[in-house]
Interface confidence: medium
């Protein structure tokens, strides 16, 4: 397995809505066709898979349809976008990607974003 | 346990068509990319060509470029090679192979071969 | 031709060592691709035999290696016996060719 190098943000605080964006870009070493970019959430030493998507250089990525990410690539670099976030969602949100095809494989992991999510307040009861 | 097994192999004249297919089983077919191999009768393997697991990135030989077509239906779990405008040079037993992604490619599995007969 | 070179034929008696090489160049081996191996005996499919220059699968024998330096690889097989007679291909990915590449193969002969 050949390593690469992947970098993003380390703090991101989501909006009100619950939406949060991060760049993940890699040092692509290869000329990969097809690459494979994993969203990863790491809290209290577990590590869950979000989301993922495989995409063709120069095309969209293409998420699950009820997945909670979406994302566009240009080059080398990835903008994610993760909705529907809760308070209880903060943690490190780990960016893997992997040159799939063609040959060799390379594997990349970025250190991680830390997400804050702070539920908003909920308005007060109007007199209206 | 992985299992490959090509079929559609058989007779055809020189200029003519055929379609090879290969069932899949044992293992997650969408996540690994897929090759055809041939051998020509007493030669050694030539590889023919080579598909991504999405099907999204395809490969050739230069010999069968523009001639052969390599495509997968991951719902069927099959890989095919349209073969067109055949010549007596493409007669081999044709091979289905697996690649490995885990760490890095090679051609892991290989199916029993089909063999292709191009004559008049 | 093959784009990677390997001798036609190798032989040896029963117990003997027995050293097969793979010959490529800058664009598959030199690129820091990996040589793979696999074995072909009479009127079966190849089977992988060493993968990523000297990893061998499960239920291959120890008296079979691998080694890669350069551009060129090798496979060895140690305390020969009658039922390594076959023949033998290296592979490699070649990045100008985008594909798989093979040796022309070594057929091997157990005296």
């Known amino acids: 397995c050949k390593a690469m190098h992947v970098a993003q943000p380390a703090v991101v605080l989501a909006s009100s809505r619950g939406i949060a964006s991060f760049v993940c870009e890699y040092a692509s070493p290869g000329k990969a066709t097809e690459v494979r970019v994993t969203v990863l959430r790491q809290a209290d030493s577990q590590v869950t898979e979000v989301c993922a998507a495989t995409y063709m250089m120069g095309n969209e990525l293409t998420f699950l349809d009820d997945s909670i990410c979406t994302g566009t690539s240009s080059g080398n670099q990835v903008n994610l976008t993760i909705q529907g976030l809760r308070a209880m969602d903060t943690g490190l949100y780990i960016c893997k990607v992997e040159l799939m095809y063609p040959p060799p494989y390379y594997l990349g992991i970025g250190n991680g974003t830390q997400i804050y999510v702070i539920d908003p307040e909920p308005c007060p009861d109007s007199d209206f | 346990e992985v299992q490959l097994l090509e079929s559609g192999g058989g007779l055809v004249q020189p200029g003519g068509s055929l379609r090879l297919s290969c069932a899949a089983s044992g293992f997650t077919f969408s996540s690994y990319s897929m090759n055809w191999v041939r051998q020509a009768p007493g030669k050694g393997l030539e590889w023919v060509s080579a598909i991504s697991g999405s099907g999204g990135s395809t490969y050739y030989a230069d010999s069968v470029k523009g001639r052969f077509t390599i495509s997968r239906d991951n719902s069927k779990n099959t890989l095919y090679l349209q073969m067109n405008s055949l010549r007596a040079e493409d007669t081999a037993v044709y091979y289905c192979?697996?690649?490995?992604?885990?760490?890095?490619?090679?051609?892991?599995?290989w199916g029993q071969g089909t063999l292709v007969t191009v004559s008049s | 031709q093959s784009v990677l070179t390997q001798p036609p034929s190798a032989s040896g008696t029963p117990g003997q060592r027995v050293t097969i090489s793979c010959t490529g160049s800058s664009s598959n081996i030199g690129a820091g691709y990996d040589v793979h191996w696999y074995q072909q005996l009479p009127g079966t499919a190849p089977k992988l035999l060493i993968y990523r220059n000297n990893q061998r699968p499960s239920g291959v024998p120890d008296r079979f290696s691998g080694s890669k330096s350069g551009t060129s690889a090798s496979l060895a097989i140690s305390g020969l016996r009658s039922e390594d007679e076959a023949d033998y291909y290296c592979?490699?990915?070649?990045?100008?060719?985008?594909?798989?590449?093979f040796g022309g193969g070594t057929k091997l002969t157990v005296l």
């Open positions: 592979a490699a990915w070649d990045d100008s060719l985008n594909g798989w590449v």
């Open positions: 192979a697996r690649d490995r992604v885990e760490m890095n490619q090679w051609l892991a599995d």
